[in-house]
Interface confidence: medium
């Protein structure tokens, strides 16, 4: 069961896996949650009654029964991992710890004006896990204003000590705030020949890449497929690093694949969620239980529901045996990966889906797109909302996109003449406007946040956030879309769609059914040629066919320009303005969302 509260002056006895150092009990709980085996923890706070060498220790624990005996101990704080919980989890930690020196390998030192600048440097440095900043009150003039970037093998400090006039904190890469580039390509027939920091078994290069992404020291990887000539190395995933952050040597080798950690865009890709099934594949590991199951899907469910299960192998039933039920082997290992992978024995293997909640909800696969046609089907665009005004009468005002459980991203120009958020209603999970009746549930708007540089759509900054009065429960018909990663600025999106209930031609009416149109992106240079009287800035993005015919139009404003990349949908643009609708050589102009990621995060993550 899910227990979120911390137990003060309480120590769990036994079950120790490992000890790490964390600056707070709250962060200890996060570390426990992300550790493959940790279910409980005991943290020691600073206290005069405690030996200072034990301050800030975070002991990660495991137990077959999922609990351990409790002992009273001053300064001890204990609790449970969030693995047992169903809510979304994030490793993002923006806290700044005053008078704490988090120790690690100090590999870079430079002068910074503030702790925030130091944290930004850490976030944009490929090796940095955390930092310590000597403030301007630091007594040693020699080290005043010095920003120390640090890393360790585990990503957590090797020790934490009290130190006056310094502050420490963590990299914000896991908060989607890094400007580092994301190299998403997987390179076939390639071996990266740099030093290995770890190796695990993986069924394919994609799982290997995800493991690399959440491993604190991994910058790139090499995976040896099951056809690799050396049998002992088949399915081996080598996690690698280098001083420069890039592979120094690439060797052409058949049946090997290599790629990069997607650390700085992990909020918009699945990292922990390995949802595929691997046929004719057996995962070896420590056996937790053997249960009868009707199918491999049922076996995966059993694994997902057993908190200690990390992966499974299902062996289908022999004809008419055991009521047609096969054997479901629930397994675990020290690192969450199989200890060995065997092929050709008829098993079907996979991973627990319990860890999917550690990924952003926006990365969840949605139902396949309906090809052709202009009318959408239910659940096709689950992030699309219709924003209604109730004054003077209720009507559709603009589109918008769900980007968080309390947040809608839309266009600023939608709120011309809107005096108060009280007159706004947000409807989600809607396909047809006619579904909206008096008693249809909606989300009230608590706050409208318009970009403070917005003047008019054509001059840019046409972006606004709506904070909802209540939170959205994610379902198949209402869920968020991923924001693009700052590291993906150079990605060329080829599968982009504009959606909305807007006009189908310039003089028309709001459509009943949500419309969709696949539209190619246009370069800003090309777009500028089409709009000589306007300044097309890098904060705008354009899309449209040269011959016209498909475009957003009145009523689509604020809605999404959604682009699919690596199986994940990204909110690339917000419908903003254009000359007429679907006119020849007049592309639609959209707010370029990637340029506002910092602004969005600043507003939505404000404490």
């Amino acid at each position: 069961e899910c227990v979120t509260q911390l137990l003060k002056d309480t120590c769990f006895e036994g079950g120790d896996i490992t000890t790490v150092f964390t600056p707070s009990a709250k962060y200890c709980q996060v570390v426990c949650t992300y550790h493959p085996r940790c279910l409980l923890f005991t943290f020691t706070a600073e206290s005069p009654s405690e030996d200072p060498t034990r301050w800030f220790t975070c002991v990660l624990k495991d137990s077959v029964t999922e609990t351990l005996p409790r002992v009273n101990r001053t300064a001890a704080i204990s609790g449970y991992s969030f693995k047992q919980c169903s809510h979304q989890i994030s490793a993002c930690n923006k806290d700044i710890y005053v008078d704490l020196d988090m120790k690690g390998i100090n590999y870079n030192s430079s002068v910074a004006k503030s702790a925030q600048e130091c944290q930004e440097r850490c976030t944009d440095d490929v090796h940095c896990h955390f930092f310590t900043y000597a403030t301007r009150q630091f007594p040693s003039l020699e080290h005043r204003n010095i920003c120390l970037l640090k890393h360790t093998q585990t990503g957590t400090p090797t020790r934490i000590t009290k130190l006056d006039k310094v502050v420490s904190g963590f990299s914000l890469k896991s908060c989607a705030l890094s400007n580092l580039a994301c190299i998403r390509d997987i390179f076939p027939n390639t071996v990266f020949a740099d030093s290995n920091i770890d190796s695990v078994m993986a069924p394919d290069a994609f799982v290997c890449g995800r493991i690399c992404t959440h491993h604190p020291g991994c910058l790139f990887f090499t995976f040896f497929s099951q056809e690799w000539p050396k049998e002992s190395q088949r399915n081996l995933c080598l996690l690698k690093t280098s001083e420069s952050g890039l592979p120094s040597t690439r060797i052409k080798k058949s049946k090997a694949l290599s790629g990069f950690s997607l650390q700085s865009c992990r909020h918009s890709i699945p990292v922990f969620c390995h949802s595929s099934f691997y046929h004719d594949t057996d995962f070896l590991g420590e056996e937790l239980d053997i249960v009868a199951a009707k199918s491999h899907e049922a076996c995966q469910k059993l694994c997902t529901n057993a908190v200690r299960c990390q992966f499974f192998t299902y062996t289908p039933a022999q004809a008419s045996c055991n009521e047609g039920k096969g054997k479901c082997y629930l397994k675990l290992s020290s690192n969450g990966s199989p200890t060995k992978i065997l092929h050709g024995r008829g098993g079907i293997s996979g991973y627990t889906l319990r860890l999917c909640k550690m990924d952003n909800e926006c990365t969840t696969k949605i139902k396949p797109r309906i090809v052709g046609g202009t009318a959408s089907v239910r659940g096709e665009w689950p992030w699309q909302v219709t924003l209604h005004t109730t004054s003077p009468t209720q009507r559709h005002l603009c589109g918008g996109s769900i980007i968080g459980n309390q947040w809608i991203l839309t266009a600023a120009h939608c709120f011309y003449g809107v005096e108060s958020p009280k007159i706004l209603r947000v409807y989600s999970g809607i396909l047809n406007q006619s579904e909206i009746k008096e008693d249809t549930s909606f989300f009230g708007v608590q706050e409208i946040i318009i970009h403070d540089q917005y003047k008019m759509a054509e001059s840019g900054y046409d972006i606004a956030l709506l904070k909802l009065e209540t939170t959205v429960n994610y379902t198949d018909s209402q869920r968020p879309i991923c924001l693009p990663s700052k590291g993906d600025r150079n990605v060329i999106y080829t599968d982009c769609w504009v959606t909305g209930w807007g006009y189908r031609k310039l003089r028309d009416k709001i459509q009943n059914t949500l419309q969709k149109a696949k539209i190619p992106l246009v370069t800003n240079e090309e777009c500028q040629k089409r709009y000589r009287g306007h300044k097309i800035t890098h904060k705008m993005i354009c899309a449209g066919y040269r011959e016209g015919g498909k475009d957003a139009c009145k009523g689509d404003s604020g809605g999404p320009l959604s682009c699919k990349h690596n199986e994940v949908w990204h909110l690339v643009g917000i419908t903003s303005w254009g000359e007429g609708c679907a006119q020849r050589e007049r592309p639609g102009v959209y707010t370029n969302v990637v340029e506002y990621v910092d602004w969005i995060l600043e507003k939505t993550q404000a404490v």
Epitope: N106, V111, T132, P139, S140, L141, E142, L148, T161, L163
Partner: antibody, heavy 121, light 108 residues
Framework: QVQLVESGGGVVQPGRSLRLSCAAS????????MHWVRQAPGKGLEWVAI?????????YYADSVKGRFTISRDNSRDMLYLQMNSLRAEDTAVYYC?????????????WGQGTLVTVSS | DIQMTQSPSSLSASVGDRVTITCRAS??????LNWYQQKPGKAPKLLIY???SLQSGVPSRFSGSGSGTDFTLTISSLQPEDFATYYC??????????FGQGTRLEIK
């Protein structure tokens, strides 16, 4: 590996000048604060001067040498210098150049082997 | 300037002994204290920084403790190569860096 090699020591008369050099290798010289520390024969360690890496104007001296000694560095050649003017008998010592580590607590983590300066008439 | 006072100024001990050297600062220096070892004719070598952190490559028989004004360096079991002079150094309020006068550790 980190290496610091001092040179330029010798016998000099009171009132005269001497320039000590320290050649650094094995680390990114320009990123580190550099010190001179001295040790009179049979005595303890005495800090002399520091040159901060991040600000060319940040040079600091012990009261005993202020106005007479000048610390300088050439980052393009990975060299640290100590220009000693108006030398006195009490300046007789082994002079060490030392690198300051980037721990939050400043430390002198690497030292040269030292060069002996004897001020005598 | 902060004054550092070491005691004793010299001491004799045998191989295998546990030895403690103390260092006192003229005002509180938090844990901004380092310890160095110097052998005759050689440059000093950093042993312990920030009062209690062991510099990499230094044997674990060396340990440091203390905070504020009083600090100690302990050698749990003396080895022949440990006979040398030991200096404490404050890096709390610098410049100037100030050293203790040194403690000479001799073979009994």
């Amino acid at each position: 590996q980190v290496q610091l090699v001092e040179s330029g020591g010798g016998v000099v008369q009171p009132g005269r000048s001497l320039r000590l050099s320290c050649a650094a290798s094995g680390f990114t010289f320009s990123s580190y604060n550099m010190h001179w520390v001295r040790q009179a024969p049979g005595k303890g360690l005495e800090w002399v001067a520091i040159f901060l890496s991040y600000d060319g104007s940040n040079k600091y001296y012990a009261d005993s040498v202020k106005g007479r000694f000048t610390i300088s560095r050439d980052n393009s050649r990975d060299m640290l210098y100590l220009q000693m003017n108006s030398l006195r008998a009490e300046d007789t010592a082994v002079y060490y150049c030392a690198k300051s580590e980037i721990l939050v607590v400043p430390t002198l983590d690497y030292w040269g082997q030292g060069t002996l300066v004897t001020v005598s008439s | 300037d902060i004054q550092m006072t070491q005691s004793p100024s010299s001491l004799s001990a045998s191989v295998g002994d546990r030895v403690t050297i103390t260092c006192r600062a003229s005002q509180s220096i938090s844990s901004y204290l380092n310890w160095y070892q110097q052998k005759p004719g050689k440059a000093p070598k950093l042993l312990i920084y920030a009062a209690s952190s062991l510099q990499s490559g230094v044997p674990s028989r060396f340990s440091g403790s203390g905070s504020g004004t009083d600090f100690t360096l302990t050698i749990s079991s003396l080895q022949p190569e440990d006979f040398a002079t030991y200096y404490c150094q404050q890096s709390y309020s610098t410049p100037p860096i100030t050293f203790g006068q040194g403690t000479r550790l001799e073979i009994k």
